[in-house]
Amino acid sequence: AFGISGVQKYTRALHDSSITGISPITEYLASLSTYNDQSITFALEDESYEIYVEDLKKDEKKDKVLLSYYESQHPSNESGDGVDGKMLMVTLSPTKDFWLHANNKEHSVELHKCEKPLPDQAFFVLHNMHSNCVSFECKTDPGVFIGVKDNHLALIKVDSSENLCTENILFKLSET
């Protein structure tokens, strides 16, 4: 798993990016954990990155992800998501040139090395949920969310609005 220092080294290089004609409105580093406080970690294995959901040891450092926020031109139907009522989308990058991607065919979440402009599969609609949690909905497949399945991240279909509060699609963002 990467430490924060590795992320900080490349963060500034990403700031100048203009993605599919749009540029981010704000960016910051945060660790990602599940509703049940398991950490999302990233490990280099056989020249590719794997994503894990695991309990960290007491003093183990959490991996950080660079969140880049974008405004969608589509209106938000959630109250409190912006004066303009615009939806927010995010991209998530745990290390230089790699972004989380939705693989809708395999129902999986993968880390892909990308050049700009980033593909739509790297964008997720951000939803503010209860208990200070967020959820990430695939831009390319509405109703499909990043979730936790068998200690890995996976794409999970949410059939109704009641299921939006299902714990396995809820995540916490933390600066520590």
Partner: antibody, heavy 123, light 108 residues
């Protein structure tokens, strides 16, 4: 209507304490980070403090660290600034401000501002 | 602490002219920078966020550019209501957040 209303300002002696409140309405308060920004008479804007939407992260300007405490009560849609050990240089109009986007984190611009409340520290 | 230096301190121009305001950060703030307009007795008003995004309701004569350490606010054609003080503000992940000292745009 989205609105912020500050109260609690007034005349206070050096070394005294004051608590400012900012009542928010018209939006989902807990989704937004909030800040206090002040402006001394005839001077520029000075960022004072910020707090994340959950209240779990707080930030302070060096000039107020250890003396001021920011907090929020999301059930009451209210932001607070507890000011202790006040000095003459703390004299200013204090604005509360809301971030533009509902990302809960403080790394954002300020779209909504209150009308400000004047704090005067003088003997 | 990241220091924002605005220049010039005062800009004397006539209506219809172009105004170019500069904001320089002592270290990189990426795109996490905004611009505000303030008139006497009023709270500041957000003009630009994310370095280049115009806030809702802001006329398109206002534009922002830059990233990293050097930023510019441009008013393409000054209208009478544009004469005010302008502040830049950085909110990068290195609190404390800071404002620049301001640029006053006055009528020549």
């Amino acid at each position: 209507e989205v609105q912020l209303v500050e109260t609690g300002g007034g005349l206070i002696q050096p070394g005294g304490s004051l608590r400012l409140s900012c009542a928010a309405s018209g939006f989902t308060f807990s989704s937004y980070a909030m800040s206090w920004v002040r402006q001394a008479p005839g001077k520029g804007l000075e960022w004072v403090s910020a707090i994340s939407g959950s209240g779990g992260s707080t930030y302070y300007a060096d000039s107020v660290k250890g003396r001021f405490t920011i907090s929020r009560d999301n059930s009451k849609n209210t932001l607070y600034l507890q000011m202790n050990s006040l000095r003459a240089e703390d004299t200013a109009v204090y604005y509360c401000a809301r971030t533009l986007h509902g990302i809960r984190a403080a790394y954002d611009a300020f779209i909504i501002w209150g009308q400000g409340t004047l704090v005067t520290v003088s003997s | 602490e990241i220091v924002l230096t605005q220049s010039p301190g005062t800009l004397s121009l006539s209506p219809g002219e172009r105004a170019t305001l500069s904001c320089r950060a002592s270290q990189s703030v990426g795109i996490n920078l905004s611009w505000y307009q303030q008139k006497p007795g009023q709270a500041p008003r957000l003009l630009i966020y994310g370095a280049s995004h115009r806030a809702t309701g802001i006329p398109d004569r206002f534009s922002g550019s830059g990233s990293g350490t050097d930023f510019t606010l441009t008013i393409s054609r000054l209208e009478p209501e544009d004469f005010a003080v302008y502040y830049c503000h950085q909110y990068s992940q290195s609190p404390p957040f800071t404002f620049g000292g301001g640029t006053k745009v006055e009528i020549k």
